[in-house]
């Protein structure tokens, strides 16, 4: 049996009918299913174009997946009285392309937010902080799930997608309490260097299935609570000494490095030495070379220094075309 990070209840649900009556505090919105016993509302695959206004005050888990929301404006979930119990909000696959500043304001108990599988052409720097102050009130978020939020190339803004996401993660230092961050499958070429320093409480970081080529400018030093670092399915060629030392210095971490195109030349020697003695890398016996051709599919743990050579660089006068 496998356990996912969010689960839905199997308690009975009440399907609501559209009503001409003014909404009662605990009435179920049209096109939704509600279970007060499970504190759960599901408005799933209903092609909703906006967040229902008449959500019951008891809602703790809200699923708004598979809709057509397009834009999440400021105060999209602000109600009077507020949705004070709402702890888990899943908006995945709802065709969101714009999340504006303050979209999640007035949700004092929001611990888990899933925006995965939305092509976010615009993510406001203040989407999670709700404030443009240099230091804003801390967000209650503990888990932020942003897998596959990269928009198609023709919908991208001029600025880098990595930079846009990073700005939202660090704004106002609001996410200092974040424990879990998933950023998988976003075509990231690099990780902006200041991001992790602003997320000191991280325990679980998933950067798998991106296009990261190097971690040279990324610092993990501050992430003393980090337990899981997922770097599978990237474009990593080698990890250099600085990165190796930082990872080894994290007291609790498990690192996942499968399915990267490791280049087994002279620059790989330090990493191989480290791999042989570290307990940090999960499944390290599965890591294999991708390049050069003569080394393809060799197991990194089985290499020695004699295997790891670099072709001498010819002086320009001797190079041939």
């Amino acid at each position: 049996t496998s356990s996912a990070s969010s689960s839905s209840s199997s308690a009975p649900f009440l399907a609501s009918a559209a009503s001409a009556q003014p909404p009662l505090p605990d009435q179920c919105p049209a096109l939704c299913e509600c279970s007060e016993a499970a504190r759960t509302v599901k408005c799933v695959n209903r092609n909703l174009t906006e967040v229902p206004t008449d959500l019951p005050l008891y809602v703790r888990n809200l699923f708004l997946t598979g809709n057509q929301l397009a834009v999440l404006p400021a105060g999209a979930f602000a109600r009077r009285p507020p949705l004070a119990e709402l702890a888990a909000l899943n908006l995945s696959g709802s065709r969101l392309d714009e999340v504006r500043g303050g979209a999640f304001e007035h949700l004092p108990s929001l611990r888990q937010l899933d925006l995965s599988h939305n092509p976010l052409a615009y993510l406001s720097p203040f989407a999670f902080s709700g404030s443009n102050a240099s230091i804003s009130a801390p967000s209650p978020l503990v888990e932020l799930i942003l897998n596959h939020i990269v928009p198609p190339d023709d919908k991208r803004q001029n600025r880098s997608f990595e930079g846009m996401v990073a700005a939202a993660l660090v704004a106002g230092r609001a996410l200092q309490g974040l424990h879990l961050l998933e950023l998988a499958s976003n075509h990231f070429l690099y990780l902006p260097r200041d991001v992790l320093a602003q997320l000191p409480s991280l325990r679980y970081l998933d950067l798998s299935n991106n296009s990261l080529v190097s971690l040279t400018y990324v610092s993990f030093r501050n992430l003393t609570h980090l337990e899981s670092l997922h770097l599978e399915d990237n474009a990593l060629k080698v990890l250099h000494n600085g990165t190796l030392a930082e990872l080894q210095g994290l007291p609790h971490v498990r690192v996942f490095l499968d399915n990267n195109p490791w280049v087994c030349d002279c620059h790989m020697a330090d990493m191989v030495t480290w791999l042989k003695q570290t307990g940090v890398v999960q499944g390290k016996d599965r890591l294999t070379c991708a390049f050069p051709e003569k080394m393809r599919n060799r197991v990194l743990l089985e290499l020695n220094s004699a295997d790891l050579d670099c072709d001498p660089i010819l002086p320009p006068s001797l190079q041939t075309s």
Epitope: S2, A4, A184, R254, G279, V280, Q282
Partner: nanobody, 120 residues
């Protein structure tokens, strides 16, 4: 198929001891760090202890430090938790946890749990 099967739970008096076991199959046990996690009635799951691949490094929640010992036998594909000086607040279902890959891919595996009850 990944399987984790816990055993060794039961009723014990305060101050007593128990040894939990977790038999693992379906993956290369020796390649992965492992953990014990517990859930007391009406409470959230709480991490208890972890151990690295070869057992060279262990760590513990403050609440169990000095009383519990995590260990593993890679030849037997088994994880252990020796629990001494048990207290009423240790009453919980204890789960063995193996994280083999990203959670979003369903690669965070749990056993069915074994109940430990500490009561006089």
């Amino acid at each position: 198929e990944v399987q984790l099967v816990e055993s060794g739970g039961g009723l014990v008096q305060p101050g007593g001891s128990l040894r939990l076991s977790c038999a693992a199959s379906g993956f290369t046990f020796s390649s992965y760090a492992m953990s014990w996690v517990r859930q007391a009635p009406g409470k959230e799951r709480e991490w208890v202890a972890s151990i690295t691949t070869a057992g060279g490094s262990t760590r513990y929640a403050d609440s169990v430090k000095g009383r519990f010992t995590i260990s593993r036998d890679n030849a037997k594909n088994t994880l252990y938790l020796q629990m001494n000086s048990l207290r009423a607040e240790d009453t919980a279902v204890y789960y063995c946890n193996a994280e083999l890959g990203p959670r979003r891919l369903g690669m965070d595996y749990w056993g069915q749990g074994t109940l430990v009850t500490v009561s006089s």
